[in-house]
Amino acid sequence: IWELKKDVYVVELDWYPDAPGEMVVLTCDTPEEDGITWTLDQSSEVLGSGKTLTIQVKEFGDAGQYTCHKGGEVLSHSLLLLHKKEDGIWSTDILKDQKEPKNKTFLRCEAKNYSGRFTCWWLTTISTDLTFSVKSSRGSSDPQGVTCGAATLSAERVRGDNKEYEYSVECQEDSACPAAEESLPIEVMVDAVHKLKYENYTSSFFIRDIIKPDPPKNLQLKPLKNSRQVEVSWEYPDTWSTPHSYFSLTFCVQVQGKSKREKKDRVFTDKTSATVICRKNASISVRAQDRYYSSSWSEWASVPCS
Amino acid sequence: RNLPVATPDPGMFPCLHHSQNLLRAVSNMLQKARQTLEFYPCTSEEIDHEDITKDKTSTVEACLPLELTKNESCLNSRETSFITNGSCLASRKTSFMMALCLSSIYEDLKMYQVEFKTMNAKLLMDPKRQIFLDQNMLAVIDELMQALNFNSETVPQKSSLEEPDFYKTKIKLCILLHAFRIRAVTIDRVMSYLNAS
């Protein structure tokens, strides 16, 4: 058993039929010695008396809010949560496996630049009685500070018969240098509590590996005289790290016909312009990627050819 | 300050070109190592990230762009140098700070060159003959060092009398390649910045 926060405790249980469970001793936080009784949740049934209560925790029915009283007055509370371990593996019932970029990916994180700020998000089909708390650091043995805000319900979508809820958190490394070469990864730890079930999820990454620039901005077309060719120009996104001559991007320019089956013409360039042939009803799209470290491409910025 | 993309200074351009070749070569070598050594811990998640140049050179700090000198987190504790102009030592205008930056890059390359050559000698003794260092990568390191044009005594290859542990050598190769790739990215950024300044 360990303390998650004040008066909230997590009992770690091996979860299998007829498992013996864990013996837990609760102590009433009071100077009083006599006349103390214990109850669980809203029930008035007295579970025991005395300053300590010993219970055998085997299942969710044994978890909950234990309260010690004296003469009708509440003295203190202890909330017991269960953390299940099945076949040596901690349960992951609360969050959905996003399977991207690999199986068992519960937390996904992205950064727009090298400023040390990043966003993580996760998915669940649970709509109520759900709380998350997020901690982060750079490195684990001698951790350096990363400050995270509160996890927020940020999107909801219908997936088949189910509603899927997305929660997000924004974090900022306390002292980040955009030019630094990372040798210790960022660690993100999410505590999830659904009713009386506790689970924890972790992710470890380097900012350089989760970079996904915003799409190029101010995408414009300039027709070239007496030609089907156009000059496409664009700019670096506002959110990208500066100076741009140090944090350079590379670009992919694509000409796509109306039909998805039509052949796509693609050009790669380090410049912020390109000359392409504009077909009727086609659109021109441009996306960006760090020129020197191949993390994710941005989403496409698009303009119609007409 | 968003620097305009100017016509490259002919003196600087060789260094930019060589640094791009270097990044390409080390990235290819790392990819090859990851594929060939698939049953070894060779991915970014599996290895310990070590920097053989730590406390010996200060490339990141010495080559910090002027725009980042206002960021206290970039200044660290050591005396930092800022690059402001330059053309790979081909121009008389090359400042002292620039020279410090480029000499730090040169020292990085020299250290990695020694490590890689020593490691290759060990790998050539491996009866499995599983992996060797790409000669192209070694050549590109050499070319960039020559383009940087520092006069420096040749460092002898480290020799080892004990029987090499090939498993450890291959893991060390992965660690070195990951670290060198990160340094090659920094070198490329620096050369691109200098080329535009």
């Epitope: 727009k112 927020t152 319900l153 999107a155 | -």
Partner: nanobody, 115 residues
Framework: EVQLVESGGGLVQPGGSLRLSCAAS????????MFWVRQPPGKGLEWVST????????RYADSVQGRFTISRDNTKNTLSLQMNSLKPEDTALYYC????????RGQGTQVTVSS
């Protein structure tokens, strides 16, 4: 006292554009996630878009993805929603909110898309 005041609604033809604004006060705007939600005539509240405190990260309901853009200016405590390629089904009362469910929202601004 928390205040959210929306503006910029109006009548627009299908395919047209509108830009909604929300002036926020009485709370720490720059550290709050912000949301746009809407209520079509005769229906319940539905979530439209979300933006993170820094403005780095945004999310959209499938029905508006690619047409609407959420943004914020933390120096002016304002939230915006740029709505392009508007459709009749976008007709609704639009609210700026501090949560996805719209429990903490402003008075709303009416958007009508009709020819």
């Amino acid at each position: 006292e928390v205040q959210l005041v929306e503006s910029g609604g109006g009548l627009v033809q299908p395919g047209g554009s509108l830009r909604l604004s929300c002036a926020a006060s009485g709370f720490s705007f720059s550290s709050s996630w912000m949301f746009w939600v809407r209520q079509p005539p005769g229906k319940g509240l539905e979530w439209v878009s979300t933006i993170s405190p820094s403005g780095d990260y945004s999310r959209y309901a499938d029905s508006v993805q690619g047409r609407f853009t959420i943004s914020r200016d933390n120096t002016k405590n304002t939230l915006s929603l740029q709505m392009n390629s508007l459709k009749p089904e976008d007709t609704a009362l639009y609210y700026c909110a501090r949560d996805l469910r719209g429990t903490m929202r402003g008075q709303g601004t009416q958007v009508t898309v009709s020819s």
